[in-house]
Interface confidence: low
C-alpha cells in the first residue's frame, strides 16, 4: 500500500558531543518491520543507518557513522521508528532524509540536524 | 580493492540507444555512489548523472535530463547506462566511476574508475 | 549548476619544475573539490579528494589546497610521468569538472 512519510518539520538541534533523535514515521501508521528503513545524507550520501530484513545492516553503513547510531524501534509496529546520534560532531550538520521501502514503494522525508558548539553558550562566570 | 569493469565498444546509428555496463567487485556495492562520466574526442570530462544502488534512484545533470537513465541490479552488483536519440555528438568514451569506501559524508567520489567504453555514432 | 574555471589549459614545465594549477568555483564549496591526473587513452585517476586530501598511493610531491571558492593542485619536483592533463572536479552537489590544464614538456 502507499504511504508518505513524515519527518520532523523544523531543524533539530544538537551540542557537539551529545546524542540526538531523529524521529520519522509512515502515515498512515502501520507495521513497517517488513519494510526498509534508513537514513542518508542527501544529495549524493553515504548511508548513516539501514535496517533491512528484519535487522540492522552495519555493513552498509558510512564509516563516519559506524558505532554511533541506533535505530530506536519501539514503535516499528506502529510505522514510527526514531534514529539516534551519538556523539555528535560538526560535520553532522545538514541535511539528513529517511526512508521506507515497502517491496518497491518508497518514500522519504527531509530533516535538518544544526549542530552547535557547547562551549559558546557557556555564560562567563 | 574495488574494481569496475565496463562493457565492450558499441557502434550504434543515430536516434538508436546504446547501453553500457559497469560490474564492481572486491567491495561493498550497495552504499555507495556510482557516477557515469564521458569524454569525447580530444575533450574535457563531463559529469552525466549518478546513482546509489541501494535506494535506486537516480541523479542526472541537466544537460541530460530526459536521455540517459541510470540504473543498478544490486543482485550482480552491476550499474547500468542507457543513453537515447543518439547524434554524432555522443560519440565519446563513457567511464563509470565509484566512490571509495572510507571517504567523507557527502562525498560523491569518483575515486574508483572503470576502463571506459567507447561508443561511436555514426550513420 | 555551479561552474569549475580551471586555469591555466595549458602550462609548459621541465623535470624537476613547482607547477600549479588553480581551480574557481562560480560559489562556495566548502572543500567538496577533488583534482583527477588522466594520460592520453587512459581513464582518469584520483590523486586529492576533499580538496586536500591525498589519495593513498599517490606520491607526496602533489598537493592541494584552498577551500571556499578557490583551490590550488600543486606538483613540487615535476616528474617525467607526472606530463598529462589534470582536471578538479566539484561535488558539493551536481558534480563538475573543469576544463583541465595540460602540463606539457616545455
Known amino acids: 500500500g502507499q504511504f508518505r512519510v513524515i519527518g520532523p518539520r523544523h531543524p533539530i538541534r544538537a551540542l557537539v558531543g551529545d546524542e540526538v533523535e531523529l524521529p520519522c514515521r509512515i502515515s498512515p501508521g502501520k507495521n513497517a518491520t517488513g519494510m526498509e528503513v534508513g537514513w542518508y545524507r542527501p544529495p549524493f550520501s553515504r548511508v548513516v543507518h539501514l535496517y533491512r530484513n528484519g535487522k540492522d545492516q552495519d555493513g552498509d553503513q558510512a564509516p563516519e557513522y559506524r558505532g554511533r547510531t541506533e535505530l530506536l524501534k519501539d514503535a516499528i509496529g506502529e510505522g514510527k521508528v526514531t534514529l539516534r546520534i551519538r556523539n555528535v560532531r560538526f560535520s553532522d550538520e545538514g541535511g539528513f532524509t529517511c526512508f521506507f521501502r515497502d517491496h518497491s514503494y518508497q518514500e522519504e522525508a527531509a530533516m535538518e540536524l544544526k549542530v552547535e558548539d557547547p562551549f559558546y553558550w557557556v555564560s562567563p562566570g | 580493492q574495488m574494481q569496475l569493469v565496463q562493457s565492450g565498444a558499441e557502434v550504434k546509428k543515430p536516434g538508436s540507444s546504446v547501453k553500457v555496463s559497469c560490474k564492481a567487485s572486491?567491495?561493498?556495492?550497495?552504499?555507495?555512489?556510482i557516477s557515469w562520466v564521458r569524454q569525447a574526442p580530444g575533450q574535457g570530462l563531463e559529469w552525466m548523472g549518478g546513482?546509489?544502488?541501494?535506494?535506486?534512484?537516480?541523479n542526472y545533470a541537466q544537460k541530460f535530463q530526459g536521455r540517459v537513465t541510470i540504473t543498478a541490479d544490486e543482485s550482480t552488483s552491476t550499474a547500468y547506462m542507457e543513453l537515447s536519440s543518439l547524434r554524432s555528438e555522443d560519440t565519446a568514451v563513457y567511464y563509470c566511476?565509484?566512490?571509495?569506501?572510507?571517504?567523507?559524508?557527502?562525498?560523491?567520489?569518483?575515486?574508483?574508475w572503470g576502463q571506459g567504453t567507447l561508443v561511436t555514432v555514426s550513420s | 549548476d555551479i561552474q569549475m574555471t580551471q586555469s591555466p589549459s595549458t602550462l609548459s614545465a621541465s623535470v624537476g619544475d613547482r607547477v600549479t594549477t588553480t581551480c574557481r568555483a562560480s560559489?562556495?564549496?566548502?572543500?567538496?573539490l577533488a583534482w583527477f591526473q588522466q594520460k592520453p587513452g587512459k581513464a582518469p585517476k584520483s590523486l586529492i579528494y576533499?580538496?586536500?586530501s591525498l589519495q593513498s598511493g599517490v606520491p607526496s610531491r602533489f598537493s592541494g589546497g584552498g577551500s571556499g571558492t578557490d583551490f590550488t593542485l600543486t606538483i613540487n619536483s615535476l616528474q617525467p610521468e607526472d606530463f598529462a592533463t589534470y582536471y578538479c572536479l566539484h561535488d558539493y552537489n551536481y558534480p563538475t569538472f573543469g576544463q583541465g590544464t595540460k602540463v606539457e614538456i616545455k
Open positions: 576533499a580538496a586536500s
Open positions: 546513482i546509489i544502488p541501494i535506494f535506486g534512484t537516480a
Open positions: 572486491g567491495g561493498t556495492f550497495s552504499s555507495y555512489a
Open positions: 566511476a565509484r566512490a571509495r569506501e572510507g571517504l567523507l559524508v557527502n562525498y560523491y567520489g569518483m575515486d574508483v
Open positions: 560559489q562556495g564549496i566548502s572543500n567538496y
